[in-house]
Interface confidence: low
């Protein structure tokens, strides 16, 4: 339905509030170094235009596309040039060529000072100072280091943000009630980031067919008692909300989001039993409510798959009718049936299916050509159950610490040119995936391993894109989104790689380490374990266990010292040449 | 319940052979290096050979060197230790033990261990 105003149909729908919000937000992610002052201008103004547009919807300017007038007001900014270099040339552009400059040129990796938090008493005061303020300095903040955060579940985040200062302020013991609800909300918002990042990176990438692939897989495991139609249409409208938002259209994203929300609640006797609870909340906690729902029970006895695609003489009639709808059928009934799979391995096992048919339906006998097909499957199915068992019996062994550190070995022996900061944090990431999913049962561990292991591969891609150095991470990530893990999980010992020289730099510590927080402690040690398979790649593992133990013994013995700073030159000199020793360096 | 039971052990002639087993139950070997070690009475307990985690790397005591001859059979979730020309000072009771991924040097280093099985070499 057309509107002669697109500006006004979106402040109606969404509201003075999140309207505001949400051009901030997208302002935040196209210019992520401006300062908040002059971004806080910038959507001030815009607000202002879209009433007179919404008072006048023939008023000048009012009905021109939303990317027209939003790159229009981006393209005011006097210091575009100095901050942004070539991002510029974007406002030489005409629509849409001139957005997709812009998107092209968002930064995952922002050279940005580390948010640092501020005491509870400064925060508190802020808070009730000036909450408005306050609340869009989050929004920014968050927007311009996250460059693809998924705008309407930011705007929930920022509920919840406000809703801790709100209670903790006036707490008798603010700290005790805040710090636990923002640390929450870090790792969260971490995690929603990375998230959202894959779907981006799955649309820009892959195109819509692959997202619309995973989102089959993944509503059909969620709601196994739909029939396929209605997650069809539920697949359709979520590709319009994902594709607007990664595509920057924020206004539009959260307008159909609340649809979809809409619809999904109107519609639930058909879709699924678990929806009654998410869909009495209000909006913002509803969308993310339903995107989060635990799976329906799977329908009672379902018929085997066979029938229809495998014994069924109609298969290649079928299939050629119409490929992506017989593939999408195939994947609905596979993914009800299998809650345990991963999403990726569901593909895979679509993927197999139709390079099968491809090839056998051309063939003399095509039934005797496809009847073995369910037996190509058993091996993709082992091969993730395998690994996520020895990396679970692992995990129980080591502890998070030490697993990611083996994982920070493997990974920097596999993929050496890669920057020391995106191995550590890639690493770590990867070894929360024991905390985060072996202490589940079987039957869940590979939908929350394997699945979450696509997304902080993902990271390693997006990261490793702005600078590539490896021809093999490139290889992994661009070949195929699916076997992205299988492709990293195969790579041996890059024997290429031609060891790092020695620097004592590196390897030099001051007494600041002693006032760090554990995790912050660990990442400096791991940092150093990188950098020392950098230095001797072939380095046994109890090489390096004996090298990072004296390590460890060294910052423990130096920050019990009288005069720290003495003991970590003099003693530092000491396990730098230790260490060479042990390593033959 | 994570356990290894070796199995193998016996009286047996000089220059004769046996072949120890060492069988996990409760996890799979495959992450794991396999460490054998002996203790014979009064003495301290001893390497004798162990078998990386690949299985690409083993190493020997040089005490057993050319007779005896690790391998695994991570399918069956066991590991051998095949002994051959065996001699009277062999004689002893054999641990088997596991250790994520690497052979370590240090006996304790060492983090599930067997119950152990009598050898003796004797005519």
């Known amino acids: 339905d057309a509107h002669k105003s697109e500006v006004a149909h979106r402040f109606k729908d969404l509201g003075e509030e999140n309207f505001k919000a949400l051009v901030l937000i997208a302002f935040a992610q196209y210019l992520q170094q401006c300062p908040f002052e002059d971004h806080v201008k910038l959507v001030n103004e815009v607000t202002e235009f879209a009433k007179t547009c919404v008072a006048d919807e023939s008023a000048e300017n009012c009905d021109k596309s939303l990317h027209t007038l939003f790159g229009d007001k981006l393209c005011t900014v006097a210091t575009l040039r100095e901050t942004y270099g070539e991002m510029a040339d974007c406002c030489a552009k005409q629509e849409p060529e001139r957005n997709e400059c812009f998107l092209q040129h968002k930064d995952d990796n922002p050279n940005l000072p580390r948010l640092v938090r501020p005491e509870v008493d400064v925060m508190c005061t802020a808070f009730h100072d000036n909450e408005e303020t306050f609340l869009k300095k989050y929004l920014y903040e968050i927007a311009r280091r996250h460059p693809y955060f998924y705008a309407p579940e930011l705007l929930f985040f920022a509920k919840r943000y406000k809703a801790a200062f709100t209670e903790c302020c006036q707490a008798a013991d603010k700290a005790a009630c805040l710090l636990p609800k923002l640390d929450e909300l870090r790792d969260e918002g971490k995690a929603s980031s990375a998230k959202q990042r894959l779907k981006c990176a799955s649309l820009q990438k892959f195109g819509e067919r692959a997202f619309k692939a995973w989102a089959v897989a993944r509503l059909s495991q969620r709601f196994p008692k739909a029939e396929f139609a209605e997650v069809s249409k539920l697949v359709t409208d979520l590709t319009k909300v994902h594709t607007e938002c990664c595509h920057g259209d924020l206004l539009e994203c959260a307008d159909d989001r609340a649809d979809l929300a809409k619809y999904i609640c109107e519609n639930q006797d058909s879709i699924s039993s678990k929806l009654k609870e998410c869909c009495e909340k209000p909006l913002l906690e509803k969308s993310h409510c339903i995107a989060e729902v635990e799976n329906d029970e799977m329908p009672a006895d379902l018929p085997s798959l066979a029938a229809d695609f495998v014994e069924s003489k109609d298969v290649c009639k079928n299939y050629a009718e119409a490929k992506d709808v017989f593939l999408g059928m195939f994947l609905y009934e596979y993914a009800r049936r299998h809650p345990d799979y991963s999403v990726v391995l569901l593909l895979r096992l679509a993927k197999t299916y139709e390079t099968t048919l491809e090839k056998c339906c051309a063939a003399a006998d095509p039934h005797e050509c496809y009847a073995k097909v369910f037996d190509e499957f058993k091996p993709l199915v082992e091969e993730p159950q395998n690994l996520i068992k020895q990396n679970c019996e692992l995990f129980e062994q080591l502890g998070e610490y030490k697993f990611q550190n083996a994982l920070l070995v493997r990974y920097t022996k596999k993929v050496p040119q890669v920057s020391t900061p995106t191995l550590v944090e890639v690493s770590r990431n990867l070894g929360k995936v024991g905390s985060k999913c072996c202490k589940h049962p079987e039957a869940k561990r590979m939908p929350c391993a394997e699945d979450y292991l696509s997304v902080v591969l993902n990271q390693l891609c997006v990261l490793h894109e702005k600078t590539p150095v490896s021809d093999r991470v490139t290889k992994c990530c661009t070949e195929s989104l699916v076997n992205r893990r299988p492709c990293f999980s195969a790579l041996e010992v890059d024997e290429t790689y031609v060891p790092k020289e020695f620097n004592a730099e590196t390897f030099t510590f001051h007494a600041d380490i002693c006032t760090l927080s554990e995790k912050e402690r660990q990442i400096k040690k791991q940092t150093a374990l990188v950098e020392l398979v950098k230095h001797k790649p072939k380095a046994t593992k109890e090489q390096l266990k004996a090298v990072m133990d004296d390590f460890a013994a060294f910052v423990e013995k130096c920050c019990k010292a009288d005069d720290k700073e003495t003991c970590f030159a003099e003693e530092g000199k000491k396990l730098v040449a230790a260490s060479q020793a042990a390593l033959g360096l | 319940q994570v356990q290894l039971q070796e199995s193998g052990g016996g009286l047996v002639q000089p220059g004769g052979s046996l072949r120890l087993s060492c069988a996990a139950s409760g996890f799979t070997l495959d992450y794991y290096a396999i460490g054998w070690f002996r203790q014979a009475p009064g003495k301290e307990r001893e390497g004798v050979s162990c078998?990386?985690?690949?299985?690409?790397?083993?190493n020997y005591a040089d005490y057993v060197k050319g007779r005896f001859t690790i391998s695994r059979d991570n399918a069956k979730n066991t590991v051998y230790l095949l002994m051959n020309k065996l001699k009277p000072e062999d004689t002893a009771v054999y641990y088997c033990?596991?250790?994520?991924?690497?052979?370590?040097?240090?006996?304790?280093?060492?983090?599930?261990w067997g119950q152990g099985t009598q050898v003796t070499v004797s005519s």
């Open positions: 078998i990386a985690s690949s299985g690409g790397s083993t």
């Open positions: 033990a596991a250790a994520v991924l690497e052979c370590r040097t240090v006996v304790r280093e060492y983090d599930y």
